[in-house]
């Protein structure tokens, strides 16, 4: 696994501990929490991640309608089981024994339940819609210059393969990010588009999970992006699964 | 490395304007905007607002809106501002400075020029 | 506009002491904070930024620590050189200073 062999640290997830125990005395990082080793040349999984940040210490318009579908993470933070790979185990319960099932970035997508509740397969989350709200600008962007500044960004620092960033639609003062990545077009090593939607909005939020760095300041052709408010929807393969009542 | 250098100081009358400027060298002037920030006497650090040299737009701080002007000159690599109906708590030391490269913190700054407002 | 309370406004300190400052915002800043040191005549120079990042060649006795509203700068022992004004910025939405910080000699 790829990590700073110089002083030993995990370039992108600030969340490990690192020791030269590695084979042949290599550095070898091991995500907190859960201590399960983590490949530092990527991105590591928002599952590991939650399980990290759980267990440290406190400190005709051209906009998207999202989905009937689309999930919004409202339950919020939770420690989560995860499976051996790192992903996120399809049905997660507290330790009241309430247990829900989640979709492939965490979301709960069904209502409640005890014990006996079946989730049968993690679904996968194949449409991320990230919705940012920006402050007032010198000027509106170049809606080309914001697409390719922020196509660059998920390239470069996320490491996602461009063909998962669907679209990019600018209305000022909102911005959408679309990401999709069906299950067949995700190959061996590529990114999860719900891991790199949890890097940009851990970045925006001024927690970036990436080694000695602060929060993600955009600029766009020298012009300062500050971002007001930021929404991400998910929207599942399946269709999740509520009760009438939660839905009135 | 890149340098800020600014103009000389200024000694003005209330209701007189007084134009500076802030000469950048050491980096691609249009990468960056231009921030302008003052500090009157024992007071607190002030943002004016700043110039995106590479369309001219400007942003200000409310509380100069209409009294301040930011322009550039790509050509010259050197920005401008400009404060009218000077008033005597005008009177400050006028900064420019440049973004950092990763963040909207300000990394380098002018020398300042100082500005004195007096009858 | 969000303002910035910092606190104290002045201190007096020796040789080798720890230093602390705070930094409070009126509204949460997400990280979004630097810290400037500045002497007198001089520019204010850029300590550190995202509330916790040191700049290249700022010694590693200045440290930032916070989230929020609520932030602090620290300067582990304090050195000649290091008595000066000390300024907090936000930059979460536009951009504003606190009142500074004299850090004075005892």
């Known amino acids: 696994h790829t990590a700073a062999q110089d002083n030993c640290t995990c370039p992108t997830n600030k969340m490990t501990v690192c020791s030269p125990d590695g084979p042949g005395g290599r550095c070898q990082c091991r995500a907190l929490g859960s201590g399960m080793a983590v490949d530092c040349s990527t991105l590591t999984s928002k599952c590991l991640l939650l399980k990290a940040r759980m267990s440290a210490p406190k400190n005709a318009r051209t906009l998207v309608r999202p989905s009937e579908h689309a999930l919004v993470d409202n339950d919020g933070l939770y420690d989560p089981d995860c499976d051996p790979e790192g992903r996120f185990k399809a049905r997660q319960c507290n330790q009241t024994s309430v247990c829900w099932c989640v979709n492939s970035v965490g979301v709960r997508r069904t209502d409640k339940g005890d014990l006996s509740l079946r989730c049968d397969e993690l679904v996968r989350t194949h449409h991320i819609l990230i919705d940012l709200r920006h402050r007032p600008t010198a000027g509106a962007f170049n809606h080309s210059d914001l697409d390719a500044e922020l196509r660059r960004l998920f390239r470069e620092r996320y490491r996602l393969h461009p063909k998962f960033v669907a679209a990019v639609h600018y209305e000022q003062p909102t911005i959408q990010i679309e990401l999709r990545q069906n299950t067949s077009q995700k190959a061996a090593g590529d990114v999860d588009i719900g891991d790199a939607a949890y890097y940009f909005e851990r970045d925006i939020k001024g927690e970036s999970l990436f080694q000695g760095r602060g929060g993600l300041d955009l600029r766009v052709r020298g012009e300062p992006l500050q971002v007001e408010r930021t929404l991400i929807y998910y929207l599942d393969e399946i269709p999740p699964k509520f009760s009438m009542k939660r839905l009135t | 490395q890149v340098q800020l250098v600014q103009s000389g100081a200024e000694v003005k009358k209330p209701g007189a304007s007084v134009k500076m400027s802030c000469k950048a060298s050491?980096?691609?002037?249009?990468?960056?905007?231009i921030h302008w920030v003052r500090q009157a006497p024992g007071q607190r650090l002030e943002w004016i607002g700043y110039?995106?040299?590479?369309?001219?737009?400007?942003k200000y701080n409310e509380k100069f809106k209409g009294r301040a002007t930011l322009t550039s000159d790509k050509s010259a690599s050197t920005a401008y501002m400009e404060l009218s109906s000077l008033r005597s708590e005008d009177t400050a030391v006028y900064y420019c400075?440049?973004?950092?490269?990763?963040?909207?913190?300000?990394?380098?700054w002018g020398q300042g020029t100082l500005v004195t407002v007096s009858s | 506009d969000i303002q910035m309370t910092q606190s104290p406004s002045s201190l007096s300190a020796s040789v080798g002491d720890r230093v602390t400052i705070t930094c409070k915002a009126s509204?949460?800043?997400?990280?979004?904070l630097a810290w400037y040191q500045q002497k007198p005549g001089k520019a204010p120079k850029l300590l550190i930024s995202?509330?916790?990042s040191l700049e290249t060649g700022v010694p590693s006795r200045f440290s930032g620590s916070g989230s929020g509203k609520d932030y602090t700068l620290t300067i582990s022992s304090l050195q000649p050189e290091d008595f000066a004004t000390y300024y907090c910025?936000?930059?979460?939405?536009?951009?504003?200073f606190g009142q500074g910080t004299k850090v004075e000699i005892k």
């Open positions: 050491g980096y691609t002037f249009t990468t960056y905007v």
């Open positions: 509204e949460d800043i997400f990280n979004r």
């Open positions: 110039i995106n040299p590479n369309n001219d737009g400007t």
């Open positions: 400075a440049r973004p950092h490269f990763e963040t909207h913190a300000m990394d380098y």
């Open positions: 910025q936000q930059y979460w939405n536009t951009w504003t």
């Open positions: 995202g509330a916790t």
